[in-house]
Amino acid sequence: FERTRSLQDPCSNCPAGTFCDNNRNQICSPCPPNSFSSAGGQRTCDICRQCKGVFRTRKECSSTSNAECDCTPGFHCLGAGCSMCEQDCKQGQELTKKGCKDCCFGTFNDQKRGICRPWTNCSLDGKSVLVNGTKERDVVCGPSPADLSPGASSVTPPAPAREPGHSPQ
């Protein structure tokens, strides 16, 4: 099948880093400067991505693979292949159209990106709040209030009383 395909389509023989050049009677030609083809059989080479402005180069372009970008400090990647850079905020904040804003009471964000999320509602699981939440941290849920009441099974029973007149072993 491969042989049949190559006889029918000379372009199928062109390896990565080349393209099938219609201007040269469909012979394989190396990709021109600042372009690439990452697979064989291409009819054109793609222009290399340029990491400019808030983007910085994580991996240089080559004739067989595109450049890869990430974001300059203070920004983070969004989208497939880091198609966008979004401003970082501090923990306890979220990015709005007007910039970084503190999380509202009852919400938190423990990262430099993303939105403020509501504190966990411990009572939904029948638990109590062990540590209060902050803008940067979620609440920590503890045992249920019933577990803390006297006579509850989870409370450790007192040590048995020693008989009078007996010294410790």
Epitope: P30, P32, N34, S62, T64
Partner: nanobody
Framework: AVQLVESGGGLVQPGGSLRLSCAAS????????WSWYRQAPGKQRELVAW???????HYTDSAKGRFTISRDNTKKTLYLQMDSLKLEDTAVYYC?????WGQGTQVTVSS
Amino acid sequence: AVQLVESGGGLVQPGGSLRLSCAASGNIFSIRVWSWYRQAPGKQRELVAWFAWDNIAHYTDSAKGRFTISRDNTKKTLYLQMDSLKLEDTAVYYCNSEDSWGQGTQVTVSS
């Protein structure tokens, strides 16, 4: 424009070696892609080996492991070292620098 002149072709037995040279003159400093092609009798010209614009050497399947492309920038010369030559390597070999072609040098592999 760039002028290219190939040399080093000849008659060689199967399993033998040849070293082709391609001397360049003119303004070569802006050229970043250098290639060797070949054309066998009755066949289409085909890419054999090349220096991509990122300075990495590449080879087509027919040349891998047997041919080595190199260059000497001070001498403005591109080379193709061909080892373990086979009958099917018989062709006219051409040097190419983006838009310029040499006149070719004949390589004949015959016992």
